[in-house]
């Protein structure tokens, strides 16, 4: 083993934060690996970990892609899977991860399950069925088209299966309300029986969820199959389609066939021999426990090792059970000593979020975001334009019950989708979607729904209310709304679009680009009014002035929000005005800010933090 | 012992094209991200290009477009396509081995250099 | 990008007196900081890296100090052959750049 320049940390309780987070494992995956990742030094070293959500933490987890606010640009997909600094102060000790590899558990993209009977389990590749092998979710054994997988490595020997996020099952945005597509469909008068991209000019799948289109004008937008989406080959970003013909030969999954190589691709039309278009399937990708493992035994201050069979040795390789080697037990004990670990727990499992003990102050650059770069806009031909960038989850209420030997067809009754109301106490929601100051009265936005808070003595809480009976054009998630103080016209902004509300007329949805964002912008974050018709423009850790009667960005005024504000959180996800203080909330807290609202006037005395607190207990005052 | 041998400068027109190499030895190449910096007569030194073991390339804003950078992990060779010199473009390029090595950031600074080739842009 | 100004430009001195060069960035960089030596027609020489540490070979009279945005190269006692130009570059944030040297010449 090797140590760093002798640096370690000086004490044994080590905190972390993930501050963000990659699409391509579920949250609570992420937050397990990590955790599990921590959990392997602390079971040979007297260290513990605990999760804290702030800046102030030892180890900051980021999620990043090429040059993501260090002198250590990323390299695209392999290569470079991430890296870590030495421990101390500031960005030391810190732990990145390229967000542009495939983060998995390593063994391929994690498909989570619908309905079935394994309870929202991932897939497993590969798993057997009827004694064939299948690399991603397959329609065989079912004559419906609906995809499924087998939640464990052999379906014919465990039984135990679930659907792949498909079309049939539910869509996603749009106006039909999460309802599958119906096919076939009449769209200009032409029948679909799969979902098309035609009427559209961003490439987005989409359906109708009746069966005519142009009499209904129901839509949705068509799930991803993330299992299924070729990299390469000539139709990178295009779907497998099975089965396909090879050489004259039906294929339900993946093949190796014909390559030397071994690697598995599929056609991406159902006949390769006469359309010749295909590309490789998904990776096994890289484990993120593994390599959180690897990057973590840096930030407490281990080189590299030159046995090759030890965790810190610097090629990846994938491998079941506890990854170290006696070379890394020793380097970490000769860092902490032997002694045992005070709590014999898991160490990483603090649920409660504390509030920041101060302001955080950290401005790392912008990081990879979990929207599509660009965002969907109205085709030529009227196809409709989706609503908000993450999905709803409401799906079929009917779980079917397996067969025999083959998952069952999908009954009719899992295509009925009920949207539930939230727990009519606001005090129960971790973080709102966006809060804005409209008409008067503080509005909680939350998957669809609304509450009115009125800062007056014996005048209560309002709601929850339909945010769709209010304004019904808009989606159901929102990423902010804002009035515009002057005028009372009220922007709502989701994904790529906004709306504007001038009482019950909207306009819109328009596409960012028509208000001068470049489709890097996948969402608005907020606004901040200005004086004289102008207001501050909030995204991702950058901040434009915005024409509020032209509704038009000043390309040339885009500066970092720590410029102007500091000490905020660089990825506020929702910045409201309220009382005449600019609030910038986080997870559960705000930030509170002083706020020189004088167009082109920046008071860096002025726009200085002077709050922090919860959104809940401080701004909605609950108990 | 480490070397890094430049290759390639010379009198060049504005407009014109020049290929930098440079032979690596003594250490394993394949391994390092490799630097070409430049230093113009009498001036202070500003880098130029940077090629990661994966390939990955990152260019200075005033190459950006004209200059490509590129390794040969098996002939140990570090490479400078120069495309549309111009008179700001003289200067003595040296290639430099990056100290850091792989996941661990840190070992900032550049712990060999070659001798520099001189590459003068002028009609 | 960061912008890293070097002091003094010129720094005239005799063999045995101490040298203190400075070279201040224009915003954190924590402690990702070279210096380098560089004497007529030859290449640059790493002598410190990340602050404070000194490279191969480097003799122990040289010695860096510094976190942030303030760092100090210090020549405890000038020998004939430190006389040079010395450059300061930081990988704090990227791009990387370099400060625009200081002449160290002899009095």
């Known amino acids: 083993f090797q140590t760093f320049k002798g640096l370690k940390w000086d004490h044994h309780n080590i905190t972390y934060w993930i501050q963000n987070y990659s699409e391509d494992l579920p949250r609570d995956m992420i937050d397990d690996a990590f955790a599990r990742a921590f959990a392997v030094w602390g079971e040979v070293a007297p260290l513990t970990f605990t999760r804290v959500y702030g800046p102030e933490a030892d180890i900051v987890i980021q999620f990043g892609v090429a040059e993501h606010g260090d002198g250590y640009p990323f390299d695209g997909k392999d290569g470079l899977l991430a890296h870590a600094f030495p421990p101390g102060a500031g960005v030391q000790g810190d732990a990145h991860f390229d967000d542009d590899e495939l983060w998995s558990l390593g063994k391929g993209v994690v498909i989570p399950t619908y309905y079935g009977n394994s309870n929202g389990a991932p897939c497993h590749f590969p798993f057997t069925f009827e004694g064939r092998s299948y690399s991603a979710c397959t329609t065989d054994g079912r004559n419906d088209g609906t995809p499924w997988c087998s939640t464990t490595a052999d379906y014919d020997k465990d039984g135990k299966f679930g659907f792949c996020p498909s079309e049939r099952l539910y869509t996603e945005h749009g106006n039909g309300e999460g309802k599958p597509c119906v096919f076939p469909f009449i769209f200009e008068g032409r029948s679909y029986s799969a979902c098309t991209t035609k009427g559209r000019s961003d490439g987005y799948r989409w359906c109708a969820t009746t069966a005519n289109y142009d009499q209904d004008k129901l839509y949705g937008f068509c799930p991803t199959r993330v299992d299924a989406t070729v990299v390469g080959g000539n139709s990178a970003g295009e779907l497998c389609v099975f089965p396909f013909v090879f050489l004259g030969k039906q294929y339900s999954s993946c093949t190796s066939d014909g390559r030397r190589d071994g690697r598995l691709w599929c056609a991406t039309t159902s006949n390769f021999d006469t359309d010749k278009k295909w590309g490789f399937c998904p990776d096994q990708g890289y484990s993120l426990f593994l390599v959180a493992a690897h990057e973590f035994g840096h930030a407490l201050g281990l080189d590299h090792s030159s046995v090759p069979e030890a965790l810190m040795y610097p090629l990846y390789s994938y491998l079941e059970g506890f990854p170290l080697n006696k070379d890394d037990i020793d380097g970490i004990q000769y860092l902490y000593g032997r002694g045992s670990k005070p709590d014999p727990r898991p160490p990483a499992t603090t649920t409660t979020e504390p509030q920041p003990t101060a302001p955080p102050t950290m401005c790392p650059t912008i990081p990879p975001t979990a929207y599509p770069t660009v965002g969907p806009t109205v085709g030529p031909t009227g196809a409709p334009s989706p609503g908000p960038t993450s999905s709803p989850s409401p799906g079929p209420t009917g779980a079917p019950s397996p067969g025999p030997t083959a998952p069952p067809t999908a009954g009719s009754s899992e295509a009925s989708t009920e949207s539930l109301s939230p727990a009519d106490n606001p005090c129960n929601v971790d973080v709102f979607d966006a809060i804005a100051e409209i008409q008067g009265a503080l509005h909680f936005f939350k998957d669809g729904w609304y509450w009115k808070f009125l800062n007056h003595r014996g005048s209560p809480l309002q709601g929850p209310f339909l945010t769709a009976r209010t304004w019904p054009a808009l989606p159901a998630t929102l990423d902010s709304a804002f009035e515009d103080p002057q005028t009372k016209r009220v922007f709502f902004f989701s994904g790529r679009q906004m709306w504007v509300y001038t009482g019950k007329t909207v306009l819109g949805p328009r596409s960012l680009d028509k208000l001068g964002l470049g489709p890097e912008v996948t969402h608005v974050s907020g606004l901040l009014p200005r004086r004289l018709g102008k207001a501050l423009l909030f995204s991702k850790g950058r901040v434009w002035r915005f024409d509020l009667k032209s509704q038009k960005v000043d390309p040339q005024s885009v500066i970092r929000v720590d410029k102007e504000f500091s000490g905020v959180p660089w990825n506020s996800h929702d910045i409201f005005q309220y009382q005449d203080k600019a609030y910038f909330c986080h997870g559960k807290f705000f930030w509170r800010v002083s706020f020189q609202n004088e167009v082109n006037k920046v008071d860096h005395e002025v726009n200085q933090v002077d709050d922090v607190g919860y959104v809940t207990y401080d701004l909605l005052q609950c108990p | 012992e480490v070397q890094l041998l430049e290759s390639g400068g010379g009198l060049v027109q504005p407009g014109g094209s020049l290929r930098l190499s440079c032979a690596a030895s003594?250490?394993?190449?394949?391994?390092?991200d490799m630097w070409w910096v430049r230093q113009a007569p009498g001036k202070g030194l500003e880098w130029v290009s940077?090629?990661?073991?994966?390939?990955?390339?990152f260019y200075a804003d005033s190459v950006k477009g004209r200059f490509t950078i590129s390794r040969d992990n098996s002939k140990n060779t570090l490479y400078l396509q120069m495309n549309s010199l111009r008179a700001e473009d003289t200067a003595v390029y040296y290639c430099?081995?990056?100290?850091?090595?792989?996941?661990?950031?840190?070992?900032?600074?550049?712990?060999?250099w070659g001798q520099g080739t001189l590459v003068t842009v002028s009609s | 990008e960061i912008v890293l100004t070097q002091s003094p430009a010129t720094l005239s001195l005799s063999p045995g007196e101490r040298a203190t060069l400075s070279c201040r960035a224009s915003?954190?960089?924590?402690?990702?900081l070279a210096w380098y030596q560089q004497k007529p027609g030859q290449a640059p020489r790493l002598l410190i890296y990340?602050?404070?540490y000194r490279a191969t070979g480097i003799p122990a009279r040289f010695s860096g100090s510094g976190s942030g945005t303030d760092f100090t190269l210090t020549i405890s006692s000038l020998e004939p052959e430190d006389f040079a130009v010395y450059y300061c570059?930081?990988?704090?944030?990227?791009?990387?750049?370099f400060g625009q040297g200081t002449r160290l010449e002899i009095k």
């Open positions: 430099a081995k990056d100290r850091a090595y792989g996941d661990y950031v840190g070992w900032n600074g550049f712990d060999y």
């Open positions: 915003q954190s960089i924590s402690s990702f």
């Open positions: 990340d602050a404070s």
């Open positions: 570059q930081q990988r704090g944030n990227w791009p990387i750049t």
């Open positions: 940077v090629i990661y073991p994966s390939g990955t390339t």
């Open positions: 003594g250490f394993t190449f394949s391994q390092y």
